[in-house]
Interface confidence: low
């Protein structure tokens, strides 16, 4: 694994300028910076259909979470699609999982109070060579 | 984009909500489920027909400071003989996640939520053929 780091110089005259730790609770601007995309991945890419390990996308909705809608991938086959368009059971479709951070309303139902939550989502599927266990 | 208010009428704002200054929100960054672990099949990044490598990006002013990004190793996919087949394409699979960005403006520090696009891995797809008229 390669590490690529960036360092931002701080004003040395500021108190606690070397405090590298984030405080436990912070006040955050309500506007989320950077991306305005919480779209259905079916619209943004058709990889889920064209992949040799195709998947279906299932909508997971939770109004107490931001983003409230997350799309979960479920591999369609146990095997992979071969050049003939058939399922090849000698290969395996497996989900690619990723931990992501979301916001959980805490206390529940409060409009502007959140806690970070780590959730595990299946993003898509990939085709892998199976691990063969040889019986002695 | 604003954090959407809960739209269901049966959710009444409880009396116990903490007071929050206008235009901001209170965020507890003690992570729920901090210790859960990904239980992916072993070494799928190497066993995949569309293998990938991982790079860790590190930024002390971001929480979490480490974000892992995947990069597809090949343009094509690896066939049964272990050779690259350029009639197929390795493509990245991406997922959005949230991070907290710490900003220094003079001596004051502010915090901003940011959406980050993470490449999680790669999958092998049949290419889209554009037929020239």
């Amino acid at each position: 694994i390669v590490k690529a780091g960036i360092t931002i110089p701080r004003n040395p005259g500021c108190p606690n300028s070397e405090d590298k730790n984030f405080p436990r609770t912070v006040m955050v601007n309500l506007n989320i910076h950077n991306r305005n995309t919480n779209t259905n991945p079916k619209r943004s890419s058709d990889y889920y259909n064209r992949s040799t390990s195709p998947w279906n996308l299932h909508r997971n909705e939770d109004p107490e979470r931001y983003p409230s809608v997350i799309w979960e991938a479920k591999c369609r086959h146990l095997g992979c699609i071969n050049a003939d368009g058939n399922v090849d059971y000698h290969m395996n479709s497996v989900p690619i999982q990723q931990e992501i951070l979301v916001l959980r309303r805490e206390p529940p139902h409060c409009p502007n109070s959140f806690r970070l939550e780590k959730i595990l989502v299946s993003v898509g599927c990939t085709c892998v060579t199976p691990i063969v266990h040889h019986v002695a | 984009r604003k954090i959407p208010k809960v739209g269901h009428t049966f959710f009444q704002k409880p009396e116990s909500c903490p007071p929050v200054p206008g235009g901001s929100m209170k965020l507890d960054i003690g992570i729920i489920n901090e210790n859960q672990r990904v239980s992916m099949s072993r070494n799928i990044e190497s066993r995949s027909t569309s293998p990938w490598n991982y790079t860790v990006t590190w930024d002390p002013n971001r929480y979490p400071s480490e974000v892992v990004q995947a990069q597809c190793r090949n343009l094509g996919c690896i066939n049964a003989q272990g050779k690259e087949d350029i009639s197929m394409n390795s493509v990245p699979i991406q997922q959005e996640t949230l991070v907290v960005r710490r900003k220094h403006q003079g001596c004051s520090v502010s915090f901003q939520l940011e959406k980050v696009l993470v490449t999680v891995g790669c999958t092998c797809v049949t290419p889209v053929i554009h037929h020239v008229q």
């Epitope: 279906n56 369609r76 058939n86 059971y89 | -």
Partner: antibody, heavy 118, light 107 residues
Framework: EVQLLESGGGLVQPGGSLRLSCAAS????????MNWVRQAPGKGLEWVST????????YYADSVKGRFTISRDNSKNTLYLQMNSLRAEDTAVYYC???????????WGQGTTVTVSS | EIVLTQSPATLSLSPGERATLSCRAS??????LAWFQQKPGQAPRLLIY???NRATGIPARFSGSGSGTDFTLTISSLEPEDFAVYYC?????????FGQGTKVEIK
């Protein structure tokens, strides 16, 4: 419209043989894996065998392995099950089933009855 | 192999009532579970695939839920044609296996 029609069932003595056929229509036969599933009288369903679209991958239940052979003729849109060394416990209605995803049986034939008795 | 246990074995209900059928797996099958309906002398008919997705042409009164080891088939309001045997089936692990069935009969 997807249609599956089984034939070839009948009464056979223990140790005997039968060949079942399943004629398929209404879909691209060679693109789909096909299965045989059976149901003993008054009992539940039991998966028997799977064959992939081009016949390259074949699976059998342990109860029939070495005695039954699944095959297909894509030019005739037909699935077969050759049953040898038949036993009384093989008595059942045999259904052929199309597979949409792995062992996802979306269409079934009406079945053909196999009776193994002396 | 994964054993699927269905309960109850028989459910006696009247038309218009709600039917709740259970299927429990001996180990997790994720969401790879289907439900079939079978009437006497007929082939099984796919109702629900991958735990909660209605198959083509299946009325909205049929719904499936659950994941992991516990699954439920719900018929919101029984019609006369719904009285039959219902089977669950998993496709998560080889070999694919079926439950022993739940008979929904007229009370």
């Amino acid at each position: 419209e997807v249609q599956l029609l089984e034939s070839g069932g009948g009464l056979v003595q223990p140790g005997g043989s039968l060949r079942l056929s399943c004629a398929a229509s209404g879909f691209t036969f060679s693109s789909y894996a096909m299965n045989w599933v059976r149901q003993a009288p008054g009992k539940g369903l039991e998966w028997v065998s799977t064959i992939s679209g081009r016949g390259g991958s074949i699976y059998y239940a342990d109860s029939v392995k070495g005695r039954f052979t699944i095959s297909r003729d894509n030019s005739k849109n037909t699935l077969y099950l050759q049953m040898n060394s038949l036993r009384a416990e093989d008595t059942a209605v045999y259904y052929c089933a199309k597979e949409e995803a792995t062992w996802d049986f979306d269409y079934w034939g009406q079945g053909t009855t196999v009776t193994v008795s002396s | 192999e994964i054993v699927l246990t269905q309960s109850p074995a028989t459910l006696s209900l009247s038309p218009g009532e709600r039917a709740t059928l259970s299927c429990r797996a001996s180990q997790s099958v994720s969401s790879f579970l289907a439900w079939f309906q079978q009437k006497p002398g007929q082939a099984p008919r796919l109702l629900i695939y991958d735990a909660s997705n209605r198959a083509t042409g299946i009325p909205a009164r049929f719904s499936g839920s659950g994941s992991g080891t516990d699954f439920t088939l719900t018929i919101s309001s029984l019609e006369p044609e719904d009285f039959a045997v219902y089977y669950c089936q998993q496709r998560s692990n080889w070999p694919p296996t079926f439950g022993q069935g739940t008979k929904v009969e007229i009370k």
